[in-house]
Interface confidence: low
């Protein structure tokens, strides 16, 4: 008879998951050098310990910390890329800006994008069935609490001037229950960040509005410099030209406002 | 699996396309390479294409005389060997490249049996 | 010539412990990985290590491979009349943006 297993609102574990994460570190650690010296299998089984056996509504940061010390990056300075619903730009500069860096261009960041997991209190098994939503079922399961202890670590160890891509199309540009707005923006070091320069990206092509007015922006800004941080805002009124701008700098259209 | 065919004999200034057919495996997860090994001689990388082929690298004595290429919805890589000489003369191996979408660098996991091009008058 | 430099031959009684060397630049065995592959007369190439010294599934442990600077070495502990074979390091070379191999190492078993 199969065995009772709890039944969670969220998807279930991705399919074929130690194997995407297996994979994926070995791609990791071979393009990128500073890396090579990482164990994959003992990645797997750090990150496996986190939330095997357990119950995953009752996950802690402390569980990934095995995992957070083997994946340990540094980024250089003024090199940081935040962002909040808008990832897939993010990644896409990023591509384009080689020497610029979002927590999915790391390690552990890389490893678990897009991805989901959990498992089942007492047995070894994974639960490819269902997983606990954050709003519906909890919010310290496996996923979440993966992403606040990664996201908390690569806020804290950020300098320089920290970068910040948001969505100008959404109703809170910033979003202050977003990973940005809950975690990244409150473990900045001000002894180490001198400033925080957000990026808002329009939406609509005749999108004319500062956007850096914004309300929610002007909250960011108070947030920001009582933490004795410098804030500056852009506004990227054409995400598609500012993407061929970075790819080629020398394009004399460039030379105007993007 | 790999498989090369399209090899044999042709004449100097001539040209051949070899191609290879993979299975057991994602394909468009891997960057792959041709490598040769002339008769009695060692082993030679030609050409390396990455993962969407979008990034190709050449070994300098076969650039503008060779051309790699891959169809992802085939499982197949292929190259096209222009102007050919008498040294070009060896045993073409398909391999694959470590998993990763960038290049095909650092090792081959997997090799096929190999093609023999014999470039003769 | 080849961009990795080998010893052309190396021999061991079955049994011994052989070490082929293969020495290279900054520009690949300095800042890349090295990979060991066995040939068999006849037969196309076999990964034998990658990443500086790890062993594929199925390869014996008889097989270890090193690095240091810009060399690497081969070790083949408990020689067996089967390691007889052709060996060859090989690279990637960031300044050829390519893949180099070693002109390889003839290893006879004597005896």
């Known amino acids: 008879l199969p065995r009772w297993r709890q039944q969670w609102s969220g998807s279930g574990t991705t399919s074929r998951f130690p194997e995407t994460v297996l994979a994926r570190c070995v791609k990791y650690t071979e393009v990128h050098p500073e890396m090579r010296h990482v164990d994959c299998q003992s990645v797997w089984d750090a990150f496996k310990g986190a939330f095997i056996s357990k119950y995953p509504c009752n996950i802690t940061e402390e569980d990934y910390q095995p995992l957070v010390k083997l994946g340990t990056q540094t980024v250089p300075c003024n090199k940081t890329l935040l962002w909040s619903r808008i990832k897939d730009l993010a990644h896409q500069f990023t591509q384009v800006q080689r020497d610029m860096f979002t927590l999915e261009d790391m390690l552990l960041g890389y490893l678990a994008d897009d991805l989901t997991w959990c498992g089942e209190f007492n047995t070894f098994e994974i639960n490819y069935q269902s997983c606990p939503d954050w709003r519906k079922d909890c919010s310290n399961n496996p996923v979440s609490v993966f992403w606040k202890t990664v996201s908390r670590r690569f806020a804290e160890t950020a300098c320089g001037v920290v970068h910040v891509m948001l969505n100008g199309s959404r109703s809170k540009i910033f979003d202050k229950n977003s990973t940005f707005g809950s975690v990244e923006v409150h473990n900045l070091q001000p002894e180490k960040v001198q400033a925080l320069e957000a990026w808002v990206i329009h939406g609509g092509r005749e999108d004319s509005r500062d956007l850096c007015q914004d309300p929610t922006i002007k909250e960011l800004e108070s947030i920001i410099s009582k933490r004795n941080i410098r804030f500056f805002c852009k506004n990227i009124y054409r995400p598609d030209k500012f993407l061929q701008c970075v790819k080629n700098p020398e394009d004399s259209s460039c030379l105007s406002g993007i | 699996q790999l498989l090369e065919s399209g090899g044999g004999l042709v004449q100097p200034g001539g040209s051949l396309r070899l191609s290879c057919a993979a299975s057991g495996f994602t394909f468009d997860d891997y960057g792959m390479s041709w490598v040769r090994q002339a008769p009695g001689k060692g082993l030679e990388w030609v050409s390396d294409?990455?993962?969407?082929?979008?990034?190709?690298h050449y070994v300098d004595s076969v650039k503008g005389q060779f051309t790699i290429s891959r169809d992802n919805s085939k499982n197949t890589l292929y190259l096209q060997m222009n102007s050919l000489r008498a040294e070009d003369t060896a045993v073409y191996y398909c391999?694959?490249?470590?998993?990763?979408?960038?290049?095909?660098?650092?090792?081959?996991?997997?090799w096929g049996q190999g093609t023999l091009v014999t470039v003769s008058s | 010539q080849s961009v990795l430099t080998q010893p052309p031959s190396a021999s061991g009684t079955p049994g011994q412990r052989v070490t082929i060397s293969c020495s290279g630049s900054?520009?690949?065995?300095?800042?890349?990985?090295v990979s060991w592959y066995q040939q068999l007369p006849g037969t196309a190439p076999k990964l034998l290590i990658y990443r500086d010294s790890q062993r594929p599934s199925g390869v014996p442990d008889r097989f270890s491979g090193s690095k240091s600077g810009t060399s690497a070495s081969l070790a083949i502990s408990g020689l067996r009349s089967e390691d007889e074979a052709d060996y060859y390091c090989q690279s990637y070379d960031s300044s050829l943006s390519g893949s180099v191999f070693g002109g390889g190492t003839k290893l006879t078993v004597l005896g």
């Open positions: 391999a694959r490249g470590s998993l990763f979408h960038d290049s095909s660098g650092f090792y081959f996991g997997h």
């Open positions: 294409i990455s993962w969407n082929g979008g990034k190709t």
């Open positions: 900054s520009s690949n065995i300095g800042d890349n990985y």
